[in-house]
């Protein structure tokens, strides 16, 4: 049964508002998709989560939400929000995961974001942000996650990114962005997924990854990349990376020589013609390897030391004889 | 702990070649840059190239281009700087460093003294 | 080539007196809004030390004495209190575009 606390908790839900205890005799709000065009004023101190999705709102006041001191979750997506003030979640020290996408956005609310040392999670994404300045992340220590995909920047923010030396996983996909500098990601050592697909790269700086030491997962699909990313070679705990729907003519030589962890490569849709003997040596993990229409590929793939393969598709090649090794190399 | 360890002083003679040796230990070696940096006696510090280990990834100081040859080798965890056609300018301790943060040189070898002399 | 150029060549300080040493770039090696300067300690028979990166980030382990300003062409070390083992050379560097390069050193004795 609900205790005597759960009652008081849930006489403090706003009008037409869902409420529900969290099971820590704190209360979880939503008010998501109720036309609402401002914040409900009769919020319970105790609110641990607050979801303002999907409503009408066009502006937050400085202070919007006094008291929310247990204040975890809160979520402004779907909005009409071209603007957030400073002073707009004071006072909200235990924020963990703020959900702003869907807004009008066009820069990231620097201000507003100072001193949020919980945030954990930071949803920007599907907002009109082409510029991120400097400093807007400074204060986000504990930030895990970033989502600032489907915007307008043209360009990384390198200097935003030199704080969040925490982040997990970052998403910059769908904007447009045409190049990346060498040391874009320098102080990223913690991120694991980095999402780039869906811009308008063309090149990489020789160095643009370095620093990524923990990077897992790396998309690059669906670019304008006309050389192979030798860039990818520092990361040395790579295990997925695409780069399909490109412009990419030849793989070279030692193409994967520094991804040994390397378990699916997604690289269909290039104008792949050439692979050099060698670039899929050394492999253990890899499962999954598809050629297709490599014309001037001749001779089989060297895959010594990629012994896990289970599915290898080559055609349109003109390879005319296999070595007598091919039977020992694969499972 | 990490390490950067370079093979003994070498003695040479005007024209000759010298290959220096950097054995790495304490981290993931194809994951950073080795740069090569030498000192004349007295003198500053003179950037000469660096390798990505286990790549074909190079650069070198134009100064240096066609008497430099810098490799690595990944089952000793070794680079190597090779420089021919020795002249008596070349005499100088050769360090090889990590590039770490930014590309700033955070773990540097112990240096290896090269003479070159008649 | 982006020249390197330390000014003074040699600085003569009194104990836990401040010392500063400038460096300046031919050319701006500012990229995306990083500096590509970082500062070394070069004592005698041993290898440099990295102290500073991209301009004024100390490196792990380094005294918090130690700091670093600047951007585009004109940046400074400073030691706010000097101290004994401080006695070194102290070169700047670029890794804007190769080739990088350093500059001629400064030598910190103490008064």
């Known amino acids: 049964g609900s205790s005597p606390r759960s009652g008081v908790l849930l006489r403090g839900c706003p009008t037409h508002c869902h409420c529900e205890p969290d099971g820590r005799m704190l209360l979880r709000v939503d008010c998501s998709d109720l036309g609402l065009s401002e914040l409900p004023s009769n919020l319970s101190v105790f609110t641990s989560y607050l979801d303002l999705s999907m409503n009408n709102i066009s502006q937050l006041l400085p202070n919007p939400l006094p008291s929310l001191r247990f204040l975890e979750e809160l979520r402004l997506a779907g909005n009409a929000l071209t603007y957030i003030p400073k002073g707009a979640f004071t006072g909200l020290y235990s924020l963990k995961v703020l959900m702003l996408q869907n807004n009008q956005l066009r820069h990231v609310p620097t201000e507003a974001l100072q001193n949020l040392r919980s945030l954990q999670s930071l949803r920007l994404d599907a907002n009109h942000i082409s510029y991120v300045p400097p400093s807007c992340f400074s204060g986000l220590h504990s930030l895990r996650h970033l989502w600032l995909d489907d915007n307008a920047l043209t360009e990384i923010p390198v200097q935003a990114f030199r704080s969040l030396s925490a982040l997990q996983a970052m998403t910059l996909a769908l904007n447009k962005i045409h190049h990346i500098p060498d040391y874009a990601f320098g102080n990223l050592s913690s991120l694991v997924v980095l999402h780039l697909h869906n811009n308008r790269i063309h090149s990489l700086g020789k160095k643009c990854f370095d620093g990524l030491h923990s990077l897992e997962t790396l998309d690059l699909n669906y670019n304008n990349l006309d050389e192979f990313p030798t860039a990818i070679r520092t990361l040395s705990n790579l295990k997925e990376l695409g780069f399909h729907s490109n412009n990419i003519r030849s793989i070279p030589e030692k193409a994967f020589v520094g991804n040994p962890s390397l378990i699916t490569i997604h690289f269909y849709d290039n104008p792949i013609q050439f692979v050099g003997r060698s670039a899929f040596q050394h492999l253990p993990e890899l499962r999954t390897l598809t050629l297709n229409g490599a014309s001037q590929i001749t001779e089989f793939p060297d895959l010594t030391g990629t012994a896990n393969l289970e599915s290898l598709t080559l055609t349109g090649a003109q390879i005319s004889s296999l070595p007598q090794t091919v039977c020992n190399q694969l499972p | 702990e990490v390490q950067l360890v370079q093979s003994g002083a070498e003695v040479k003679k005007p024209g000759a070649s010298v290959k220096v040796s950097c054995k790495a230990s304490?981290?993931?070696?194809?994951?950073?840059?080795i740069e090569w940096v030498r000192q004349a006696p007295g003198q500053g510090l003179e950037w000469i190239g660096e390798?990505?280990?286990?790549?074909?990834?190079?650069d070198y100081n134009e100064k240096f281009k066609v008497r430099v040859t810098i490799t690595s080798d990944t089952s000793t965890s070794t680079v190597y700087l090779e420089l021919s056609s020795l002249r008596s300018e070349d005499t100088a301790v050769y360090y090889c460093?990590?590039?770490?943060?930014?590309?700033?040189?955070?773990?540097w070898g112990q240096g290896t003294l090269v003479t070159v002399s008649s | 080539d982006i020249v390197m150029t330390q000014s003074p060549d040699s600085l003569a300080v009194s104990l836990g007196e401040r010392a500063t040493i400038n460096c300046r770039a031919s050319?701006?090696?500012?990229?995306?809004?990083?500096?590509?300067m970082h500062w070394y300690q070069q004592k005698p028979g041993q290898p440099p030390k990295l102290l500073i990166y991209?301009?004024?980030n100390l490196e792990s382990g380094v005294p918090d004495r130690f700091s670093g300003s600047g951007s585009g062409t004109d940046f400074t070390l400073t030691i706010s209190s000097l101290q004994a083992e401080d006695v070194a050379v102290y070169y700047c560097?670029?890794?804007?575009?190769?080739?990088?390069?350093f500059g001629q050193g400064t030598k910190v004795e103490i008064k």
């Open positions: 390798i990505l280990p286990g790549s074909d990834s190079t």
């Open positions: 050319e701006s090696v500012d990229n995306y809004g990083n500096s590509f």
């Open positions: 560097q670029q890794n804007y575009e190769d080739p990088f390069t």
């Open positions: 304490g981290y993931t070696f194809s994951a950073y840059w």
């Open positions: 460093a990590r590039g770490g943060h930014y590309g700033s040189l955070d773990y």
């Open positions: 991209l301009a004024s």
